[in-house]
């Protein structure tokens, strides 16, 4: 799940702190949601498996002018600081379904919580 660039070498799993902080931020977004998140902007749904962090970043980055998710975008960048190679982008961008940002965040949060419970910090 850790994204690999053209010059990347795989290492140990990410520390639980980074995942926990990301989960906390997503919880904060969902709980503080008054109006439609990001004015109901739509984003591409992603495959919550390999390359998930990079794919989530690539999807959410297309929401402009929404301060509520900028911290999330930056936190995802910690898992995926350098672009994955061109060949890997094809698997990240299976662009067939769009969903609201709020739903995207909820789906991502549920999946990350599951990973955290199972100790899969990568």
């Amino acid at each position: 799940l850790t994204c690999l660039g053209g010059f990347a070498s795989p290492g140990p799993v990410p520390p639980s702190t980074a995942l926990r902080e990301l989960i906390e931020e997503l919880v904060n977004i969902t709980q503080n949601q008054k109006a439609p998140l990001c004015n109901g902007s739509m984003v591409w749904s992603i495959n919550l498996t390999a390359g998930m962090y990079c794919a989530a970043l690539e999807s959410l980055i297309n929401v402009s002018g929404c301060s509520a998710i900028e911290k999330t975008q930056r936190m995802l960048s910690g898992f995926c600081p350098h672009k994955v190679s061109a060949g890997q982008f094809s698997s990240l961008h299976v662009r067939d379904t769009k969903i609201e940002v709020a739903q995207f965040v909820k789906d991502l949060l549920l999946h990350l919580k599951k990973l955290f419970r199972e100790g899969q910090f990568n």
Partner: antibody
């Protein structure tokens, strides 16, 4: 306040080794990717290495196989192990918080000077 | 590797002047509609400071007199009204492709 403080620089002979350290404070270190960037005397900036929150590492060809970036989240510290040093590695080495390809290098330390000379 | 070429390499300007620095990439640094170019300021003996990310986004805390524009291969950093604290060297950087590369810098000096 975000602070990054580099140490470990100094004079080393060609072929020698050196380990740089960067002490981070004022932010949750483990939640950020980090990088090293260097600047030869009177020259421009050159990216040297990056490490993700998951310890995935990235290097340019110029240092790959000679330099190793690592982190110790318990100590809020970033490291750069430099082996087989060459004269062209002489530079000020900066530690930087890396917020990714979409956001850039958002915080920098003051740097530590590495001189490779016989 | 992507080469980033800045021009001019140095310029002299007065306080209040409008200053424009250009950066040209050897190939497109656009990625799904985003331009992956960032601008930094460095003063002598100091660490670089991020000014603009993704070509045109002002980093938090950076004065609004700084602005960035461009896409593809051609980018511009503009200082609308030069202030005494703006005399420094400015660098562009691309993050579209590894290795990340910087421009050679543009030194802004007092006229």
């Amino acid at each position: 306040e975000v602070q990054l403080v580099e140490s470990g620089g100094g004079l080393v002979q060609p072929g020698g080794s050196l380990r740089l350290s960067c002490a981070a404070s004022g932010f949750t270190f483990s939640s950020y990717a980090m990088s090293w960037v260097r600047q030869a005397p009177g020259k421009g900036l050159e990216w040297v290495a990056s490490i993700s929150t998951g310890d995935t590492t990235y290097y340019p060809d110029s240092v790959k196989g000679r330099f190793t970036i690592s982190r110790d989240n318990a100590k809020n510290s970033l490291y750069l192990q430099m082996n087989s040093l060459r004269a062209e590695d002489t530079a000020v080495y900066y530690c930087a918080r890396n917020e990714g390809y979409y956001f850039g290098l958002t915080q920098w330390g003051r740097g530590t000077l590495v001189t490779v000379s016989s | 590797d992507i080469q980033m070429t800045q021009s001019p390499s140095s310029l002299s300007a007065s306080v209040g002047d409008r200053v424009t620095i250009t950066c040209r990439a050897s190939q497109s640094v656009d990625h799904f509609g985003w331009s992956l170019v960032h601008w930094y300021q460095q003063k002598p003996g100091k660490a670089p400071k991020l000014l603009i990310y993704r070509a045109s986004n002002l980093e938090s805390g950076v004065p609004s007199r700084f602005s960035g524009s461009g896409s593809g291969t051609d980018f511009t950093l503009t200082i609308s009204s030069l202030q005494p604290e703006d005399f420094a060297t400015y660098y562009c950087q691309q993050s579209n492709e590894d290795p990340w590369t910087f421009g050679g810098g543009t030194k802004v000096e007092i006229k």
